[in-house]
Interface confidence: low
Amino acid sequence: GITIPRNPGCPNSEDKNFPRTVMVNLNIHNRNTNTNPKRSSDYYNRSTSPWNLHRNEDPERYPSVIWEAKCRHLGCINADGNVDYHMNSVPIQQEILVLRREPPHCPNSFRLEKILVSVGCTCVTPIVHHVA
Amino acid sequence: GITIPRNPGCPNSEDKNFPRTVMVNLNIHNRNTNTNPKRSSDYYNRSTSPWNLHRNEDPERYPSVIWEAKCRHLGCINADGNVDYHMNSVPIQQEILVLRREPPHCPNSFRLEKILVSVGCTCVTPIVHHVA
């Protein structure tokens, strides 16, 4: 019977776990042709809960570069341009799928991986814990 | 520059088409074991730019269910709990990778697809266009 390539150390599609290993065409189809990527590019600066973007690079991951948002302040920017600590800047997080090279350094063998990334920040009313 | 040596146990791939078709193990490795998924679950309600979450389901996509944020107001919620139209609620969007079944209905053949999703909303100072 046929198995997916089984050079030493390479993945194999075991019948028992099928379809554990699937074939993926990496020619990315981009559904975002009508969107302007710059449309939200300045929100990080104009937000009342501004953030900085940090480059997270990992050659063993696809995509290898992911941008992580870090909120600039614990509080939020008020109308006077000052930080108001009665409010909180919090990261909006999302679980995303990435491909992790497995075994390491293989150009065309991956495992699906779920990672949590911070996309931006929003300003929320803090939860106040009252002492009984 | 440094090149990481290719693992000799990697599946074969012709350079000409490399790496159009790759093997992907769908047993998801979750790096988020220490994160509490509920941690940010109420931000959508507590934010000064609150949002609703809409379920987007597509059986031909992996993951098949994606939650899309829609800002509730054009403006932001002020300290009095009213909508302040001097500020704007805007969606924070992110490009994410999903797997699209190709050909349709195939259980184990996919194409990588990039889609734009709204993760949440943030409150920004509006850009005021002055008339000359």
Partner: antibody
Framework: EVQLLESGGGLVQPGGSLRLSCAAS????????MSWVRQAPGKGLEWVSA????????YYADSVKGRFTISRDNSKNTLYLQMNSLRAEDTAVYYC???????????WGQGTMVTVSS | NFMLTQPHSVSESPGKTVTISCTRS????????VQWYQQRPGSAPTIVIF?????PSGVPDRFSGSIDSSSNSASLTISRLKTEDEADYYC?????????FGGGTKLTVL
């Protein structure tokens, strides 16, 4: 080891019917789509029909649509091809194949001969 | 439906390299995987290349597959030819609801 064993072939008159079976072993049958491919004497390969692992989706070549029915019994690890209104041009060796992915026949049986002649 | 066109026959000497082409009549070849099957006389076909360029275990690295989107064609290349490579070779592709084989190419190792 994957094994596919076809049976049910034979001589049949034009307009007649025949039911082919394919007994599968060595793998989790219900996890795989299965196909029938035929080869007329001295000719090339021709895809006939395919069925999803659950049996919920079936596909047919235009040349057999409406006459042939593919089905499977996952409890018996068996694939079937019910052939009605047979014609002389249906004469061929019929192979059962396990699909690696849709449209990719990864493992093949040895085939069963079907002869349609008066 | 589309068709896959292959040369009827090719021949080459042992130790040499031979390439068999397969052209898709309509629909982009790049959108669907191409497979190659080997069939020796009196035997069932066996897959030698799947998903354009992937080799199943047990298939020698002398066999390689490629596609050329500009000509909408696929190729099977066999290097360091051996007498045991003499067989019929079929390319195969598909659409979302049907599967199509090429007419086959008879490879003669002189």
């Amino acid at each position: 080891e994957v094994q596919l064993l076809e049976s049910g072939g034979g001589l049949v008159q034009p307009g007649g019917s025949l039911r082919l079976s394919c007994a599968a072993s060595g793998f989790t049958f219900s996890s795989y789509a299965m196909s029938w491919v035929r080869q007329a004497p001295g000719k090339g390969l021709e895809w006939v029909s395919a069925i999803s692992g659950s049996g919920g989706s079936t596909y047919y070549a235009d040349s057999v649509k409406g006459r042939f029915t593919i089905s499977r019994d996952n409890s018996k690890n068996t694939l079937y091809l019910q052939m009605n209104s047979l014609r002389a041009e249906d004469t061929a060796v019929y192979y059962c194949a396990r699909d690696l992915i849709w449209g990719v026949a990864g493992s093949w049986g040895q085939g069963t001969m079907v002869t349609v002649s008066s | 439906n589309f068709m896959l066109t292959q040369p009827h026959s090719v021949s080459e000497s042992p130790g040499k390299t031979v390439t068999i082409s397969c052209t898709r009549s309509s629909g982009s070849l790049a959108n669907y995987y191409v497979q190659w099957y080997q069939q020796r006389p009196g035997s069932a076909p066996t897959i030698v290349i799947f998903a354009n360029n992937q080799r199943p275990s047990g298939v020698p690295d002398r066999f390689s597959g490629s596609i050329d989107s500009s000509s909408n064609s696929a190729s099977l290349t066999i290097s360091r030819l051996k007498t045991e490579d003499e067989a019929d070779y079929y390319c195969q592709s598909y659409s979302p609801s049907s599967v199509v084989f090429g007419g086959g190419t008879k490879l003669t190792v002189l």
